[in-house]
């Protein structure tokens, strides 16, 4: 058992109290991180307390104001930039969301050498994407779906593409779907390293249907929100990739990267763009059918000033047992040579681990191996390869950082933070400054978080950053409740577990059990994190059991649980959900009469289908913004697991794995179901279809909507949704208020 | 306009100590560091150290340590340079110097503070 | 600590010519992309004068006729046509590791 977080034993009981609703609303018990924005090997920015912008030289211990916060607060800025070159810092205000990354802002250019704005050829507002180039202090920004260049901030802009629309053209910056789906930023243009070339994307969303939701406001009438969005099956963005010299921008014009031929004999995506020198680019490519991924490493010709790729320099990547990659297929790291790369992918036996490309994916040397999982690459340097992975312990819900010594044969491996905090500290995330001179860690828990800062060269701790002190005093008179993380072997499938225990739990005694489930595919929800949430306020108030199970189709523990779930959503998802619940009954403590599941999203949908499963396990439960057919979801998310809802393809369990062909099962449950209005996401649609479908089988439920939310629920309706789902779990656990 | 206004020339005994102020005005004393630079009679430039104002962090000149202390008083905009220990090679002339970070450089010079170390 | 060699120690030259200011340092001063060295010029009874940040970036104020340029550990600071009033010692100065060194200075004088 994992007590969090430890604290001094305080004998006087009495001064102890339970965590309360206000308080998660609250964010009371909220904790923080440090990132450095590194600017170099040994300096770093970060913004203080008071909102200046400082930077601390690691080197000679000293720090300096860069930017003070009267600067930030005259035109209202929430974020900050520095030029390469040191000369300038963009100030960012105005901040105004679209979806999950995109937001648009206003910009303004401030001169350091002066101490004054940039006046003359501002910039528009409001702009979607704006970078500097990673040398000097040029400038590519999009503005209206077009894409513009500055030499240096005050020149007039160059316009590197015309055609740009709303709706219909985007350049260098995605639609929806790839925002959402593939890209999973607010960005689709990359810079070459030194500045010379910029690469961006055009998604043409011409022939894309479109999701119109109304959104309510304050009007008379509503607005009609217009999305193009691909669902399953529906026609997709034509993506091409064109890359611009910005030295002499109007001189060839943007040069269009070709297609692998593989690639554009049928439909196809682009997923991601490595650049490896400023004349050699990397682009990844994806099938429609996401079992087969095709690297492409492509080079400048200088005298035809186009880019070749050729067919030599295309690594296929494919997977015959799901899909390609985890959640998206993993980008490549170039080392030195500029032509070899690693990459995590499956190996042999089925674990996604780190392997070394030199000419052809066939002769792929591996990295790392074992019954784990290689997570993420943070950084290669000509003598150290720095990743996280799973393996310490076996637990796959930690992650540790691990440093490869590539210089040195054969290669040694020693994990950096294995031992550096081991019962506080057990998943980490890094943030590594040029050629990793110096690191910073962040620990996520399962204890209070803490951010250090080390060098490079030998790990050694140089400081903490952020300790979260003001949280560790808060909690020292909060009872909180206790956690484990631990398994159920059942029929030949591992299915990890976390309980979470109210603070005097008795295993003689019978509690109510609140199952929470996300499930998706590469997901999970079993982690050593630290979180003082929700739940976590069921079990210290309301003496609650609370279990996250990760089944089948979850993350990080090889192939075979991964890819079980490959064209049959809906399916072991939520099996191993009931099985898990058979086996919390089966330890005695659980009241069998008191059991109930929520989940939002991908957990909405499998709460629903399990609540409808039949098995009278569950007395009630509550969908949050669910998906209740694969027909309604995006096609690059929905496909990659389901294939095509088309008759000669997977259209048969796109319909038997709807939550509406279950209607008839909810009779026996206490349902809750809860959307917002305005999720461009996961649609209302799909709860406006189950609450047709049981008025249809004439199944009493309960519902509330959230006019004019999205996806997330935020501002006051998290309040309201929070306090309404409480006391509906209450009532459904005879718990008084 | 910025301007660094420091205080009067000093003539000091061996082993004793010297205290230079340099008041800054134009600008927010907490948005810069300062650094003090010396220079001997017909000789070269000579680092001392920096301050940071907002914490009142310091690094000084390893050559210096021990003898030199950087202090700010934040509500008249001074700071506040003492070496002790003087001895006949101190004779310089002090400069306090804005220091702005982000670019490594000393932009605004104070007029100078004579220091002259004589038995 | 860095170490940074001026040369040459004295340039006699007349009003309208080109002065090259040559700074060698004992190691290299470059921080990841940029070099950290600065010039300056000072005037008898008179404190520096910050010309050239960074290598290259014109100070405020500073005319054109001064620019820098240089990577690693040599370094130039040219005036591309004296002017009367350019006449003055030249110090150049490393940011880039403590102790923060100058140069020993070259004197620019009317020949």
């Known amino acids: 058992i994992v007590l969090r977080p430890s604290r001094v034993h305080n004998s006087e009981e009495n001064t102890m109290r339970a965590l309360t609703l206000k308080d998660i609303l609250n964010g009371t018990f909220s904790y923080k991180t440090f990132f450095p924005n590194w600017i170099s090997g040994q300096e770093y920015l970060h913004q203080s307390a008071d909102n200046n912008i400082v930077l601390y030289n690691i080197e000679t211990g000293q720090s300096y104001t860069i930017l003070s916060n009267r600067t930030m607060k005259s035109v209202n800025a929430s974020n900050y930039g520095l030029s390469p070159d040191r000369q300038f810092v963009y100030l960012e205000s105005d901040y105004s969301k679209l979806w999950r990354y995109s937001y648009t802002a206003t910009y303004y250019i401030y001169d350091l050498s002066n101490g004054e704005f940039v006046r003359g050829n501002e910039l528009p507002r409001p702009i979607q994407y704006l970078c500097w180039s990673p040398v000097g202090s040029k400038l590519a920004y999009v503005y209206q779906n077009n894409i513009y260049l500055k030499q240096r901030p005050g020149d007039p802009p160059f316009q590197i593409t015309f055609n740009g629309r709303e709706n219909k053209i985007f350049n260098g910056i995605p639609d929806w779907v790839y925002e959402e789906e593939m890209l999973a930023t607010k960005y689709a243009l990359w810079w070459s390293p030194n500045g010379k070339f910029l690469a961006y994307a055009e998604f043409n969303d011409t022939d894309i249907p479109v999701i119109a939701y109304s959104y309510y406001g304050d009007e008379q009438y509503p607005r009609t929100i217009n999305i193009p969005y691909p669902k399953a099956g529906a026609k997709n963005p034509v993506v091409r990739i064109f890359i611009i010299d910005t030295t002499y921008p109007a001189y060839v014009g943007p040069q269009e990267v070709p297609v692998p031929a593989m690639i554009a004999s049928s439909d196809y995506y682009f997923s991601w763009l490595t650049w490896v020198t400023d004349e050699r680019v990397c682009l990844q490519w994806l099938k429609r059918v996401q079992n087969v991924s095709v690297l492409s490493i492509c080079d400048f010709r200088e005298d035809w000033q186009t880019w070749d790729c050729p067919k030599t320099q295309e690594h296929i990547e494919e997977s015959r047992t799901g899909w390609a990659g985890g959640f998206f297929v993993s980008t490549p790291v170039f080392s030195y040579d500029a032509i070899s790369y690693y990459k995590i992918f499956s190996d042999k036996d089925g674990y996604k681990h780190i392997h070394y490309i030199k000419d052809t994916v066939e002769n792929a040397i591996q990295i790392t191996s074992g019954k784990w999982e290689a997570i993420n690459i943070f950084r290669v340097t000509q003598d150290s390869l720095f990743y996280s992975s799973n393996e310490f312990e076996e637990y796959p819900g930690r992650r540790n950082i691990y440093r490869i010594s590539i210089g040195s044969y054969p290669p040694s491996k020693k994990c950096v933070t294995c031992h550096l905090r081991k019962e506080r500290c057990q998943y980490y995330t890094a943030s590594f400054s040029d050629y990793a001179k110096y690191y910073a860690l962040v620990c996520y828990g399962p204890g209070i978080p803490i951010s250090t800062l080390h060098d490079g060269r030998t790990d050694q701790e140089i400081k903490i950053l952020e300790e979260n002190k003001e949280l560790e005093n808060a909690l020292k008179n909060i009872q909180l409740p206790k956690e484990e993380i631990k398994k159920l072997e059942v029929d030949e499938i591992t299915l990890w577990y976390k309980m979470i225990l109210p603070p005097q739990f008795d295993r003689s005694k019978k509690y109510p059990l609140l199952i929470q489930v996300y499930g998706g595919p590469c997901s999970q929800s079993v982690r050593s994190v630290f979180a003082v949430n929700w739940i976590s306020y069921l079990a210290s108030k309301e003496g609650m059991v609370i279990a996250l199970v990760d089944g089948r189709g979850t993350a990080f523990q090889g192939d075979k649980l991964l890819y079980a779930v490959y064209r049959k959503l809906g399916v072991y998802e939520v099996e191993d959900q009931i099985t898990a619940v058979r086996k919390f009954i089966e330890m005695g403590f659980i009241d069998e009469k008191r059991i109930a599941i929520w989940g939002w999203s991908y957990g909405g949908y499998v709460s629903s289908l399990a609540l409808a499963s039949g098995t009278g396990l569950f007395k009630c439960g509550i969908a949050v913004a669910p998906v209740s057919s694969w027909e309604y979801y995006a096609s690059v998310y929905t496909e990659r697991f389901m294939g095509l809802p088309t008759k000669d393809d997977n259209l048969e369990h796109y319909k038997n794995s709807t939550v509406m062909a279950r209607a008839e099962y909810f009779r026996n449950v206490d349902y809750l179901l809860i959307h917002g209005t305005a999720d461009d996401n996961v649609h209302f649609q799909n709860s406006a279809q189950i609450a047709k479908a049981l008025v249809n089988a004439q199944v009493d439920f309960q519902a509330m909507w959230y006019s004019d939310q999205n996806h997330g629920l935020s501002g006051l309706s998290t309040n309201h949704l929070y306090t309404h789902m409480t006391h509906f779990l209450k009532q459904c656990f005879s718990l008084s208020d | 306009q910025v301007q660094l206004v420091q205080s009067g020339a000093e003539v000091k005994k061996p082993g004793a100590s010297v205290k230079v102020s340099c008041k800054a005005s134009?600008?927010?004393?907490?948005?810069?560091?300062m650094d003090w630079v010396r220079q001997a009679p017909g000789k070269s430039l000579e680092w001392i150290g920096d301050?940071?104002?907002?914490?009142?962090?310091?690094i000084y000149n390893q050559k210096f340590k021990g003898r030199v202390t950087m202090t700010i008083d934040k509500s008249t905009s001074t700071v506040y340079m003492e070496l002790s220990s003087l001895r006949s090679e101190d004779t310089a002339v002090y400069y306090c110097t804005r220091f702005r970070g982000i670019h490594y450089a000393m932009d605004y010079w104070g007029q100078g503070t004579t220091v002259t170390v004589s038995s | 600590e860095i170490v940074l060699t001026q040369s040459p120690a004295t340039l006699s030259l007349s009003p309208g010519e080109r002065a090259t200011l040559s700074c060698r340092a004992s190691?290299?001063?470059?921080?990841?992309?940029?070099?950290?060295i600065n010039w300056f010029q000072q005037k008898p009874g008179q404190p520096p004068r910050l010309l050239i940040y960074g290598t290259s970036n014109r100070g405020s104020g500073i005319p054109a006729r001064f620019s820098g340029s240089g990577s690693g550990t040599d370094f130039t600071l040219t005036i591309s046509s004296l002017e009367p009033e350019d006449f003055a010692v030249y110090f150049c100065q490393q940011s880039n590791e403590v102790p923060y060194t100058f140069g020993g200075g070259t004197k620019v004088e009317i020949k």
């Open positions: 301050i940071y104002p907002n914490t009142g962090g310091t």
């Open positions: 134009g600008y927010t004393l907490t948005d810069y560091n």
């Open positions: 190691e290299s001063v470059d921080n990841y992309g940029l070099s950290f």
